[in-house]
């Protein structure tokens, strides 16, 4: 069995920030899980991380350098990603695993999200260099 | 048949760090199944440090998280297992084993006795 | 975490006795009418081996004389009639949520 995975097929950043909604054929109440977010075709970039416990607060966390925070619904968790920059417009998968109470379930590969970033220009750190100038 | 065997243990100084490796074979860690890292102190009960899926999300104990990591080379189907900052209640023996559907452990290596001592 | 506490901690028997060991949870470890309790013999200087898993279904190539019962909170593991071999201690565990906890174990050691 597999869980079943929507997002919405594309989304625009106008201010450098989107919510971006996953939402599953699961209910996850009461379950410990993983829920992560993944930029590109090859989902090469773990953009998010969301830990469900069922004693804890939500674990949020990026290891990738993006700004992300998150929010848990009964069959939902939505990823809000702020500062992206306009060379980040891509295609984003959520992915989910869920681990206890067994048995363990994942989800079959959604078909994603293109966000297509159209903010304003940030001027990106030393970690996220821009296009460089001639 | 699966067939699990750990190695890397031996005497380490308090403070120091310890990579214990456990080779399977007869079956792909990246399979279907997950993989998880179980002590036992002398004369003691047995103590769960954490797991690895086959997907490669970990999960661990919370009494050990800051210090533990759990890894695994796919091409040498090879679990390993990191602890830092070692003290003497560390000192144990160290099991791999397989979890099966309903996350009992099926599979056991044999055990790797560590022991942290000056 | 789930504390599992058994009881007893240890115990005296003969060859041919029945014994029973009992595993209490500090709370359910059922879900959707399947109770992650297991339940393992360990011998010195070896690695533990399953004997029971989900509370009731004897592991493959486990004699028979074994036996688990028990839903909820409340779990026994029975030996229906003790051979030599097994004179061991056991434990139980659930695997209901994280931490994944042990019970203190069960020496069954000879009259």
């Known amino acids: 069995n597999k869980i079943l995975v929507k997002q919405s097929p594309m989304l625009v950043a106008y201010d450098n920030a989107v919510n971006l909604s996953c939402k599953y054929s699961y209910n996850l109440f009461s379950r410990e899980f993983r829920a992560s977010l993944h930029k590109g075709l090859d989902s090469a970039v773990e953009v998010c991380v969301v830990y469900g416990n069922y004693s804890q607060q939500l674990q949020v966390y990026s290891k990738t350098g993006f700004n992300c925070d998150g929010k848990l619904g009964n069959e939902s968790v939505t990823f809000y990603l702020q500062n992206l920059y306009v060379n980040q417009t891509d295609i984003y998968f959520c992915k989910i695993e869920v681990m206890y109470p067994p048995p363990y379930l994942d989800n079959e590969k959604s078909n994603g999200t293109i966000i297509h970033v159209k903010g304003k220009h940030l001027c990106p750190s030393p970690l996220f260099p821009g296009p460089s100038k001639p | 048949e699966v067939q699990l065997v750990e190695s890397g243990g031996g005497l380490v100084q308090p403070g120091g760090s310890l990579r214990l490796s456990c080779a399977a074979s007869g079956y792909s860690i990246t399979s279907g199944h997950h993989w998880s890292w179980i002590r036992q102190a002398p004369g003691k009960g047995l103590e769960w440090i954490g797991e690895i899926y086959h997907s490669g999300s970990t999960y661990y104990s919370p009494s050990l998280k800051s210090r533990v990591t759990i890894s695994r080379d796919n091409s040498k189907n090879t679990l390993y297992l990191q602890l830092n900052s070692l003290r003497a209640e560390d000192t144990a023996v160290y099991y791999c084993a397989r979890k099966d559907d309903y996350y009992a452990f099926d599979y056991w290596g044999q055990g790797t006795l560590v022991t942290v001592s000056s | 975490d789930i504390q599992l506490t058994q009881s007893p901690s240890s115990l005296s028997a003969s060859v041919g006795d029945r014994v029973t060991i009992t595993c209490r949870a500090s709370?359910?470890?059922?879900?959707?009418?399947?109770?992650?309790l297991h339940w393992y013999q360990q011998k010195p200087g070896k690695a533990p081996k399953l004997l029971i898993y989900a509370a009731s279904t004897l592991q493959s190539g486990v004699p028979s004389r074994f036996s688990g019962s028990g839903s909820g909170t409340d779990f026994t593991l029975t030996i229906s009639s003790l051979q030599p071999e097994d004179f061991a201690t056991y434990y139980c565990q659930q695997s209901y949520r994280t931490p994944i906890t042990f019970g203190q174990g069960t020496k069954v050691e000879i009259k």
């Open positions: 709370e359910s470890v059922d879900f959707y009418g399947i109770s992650f």
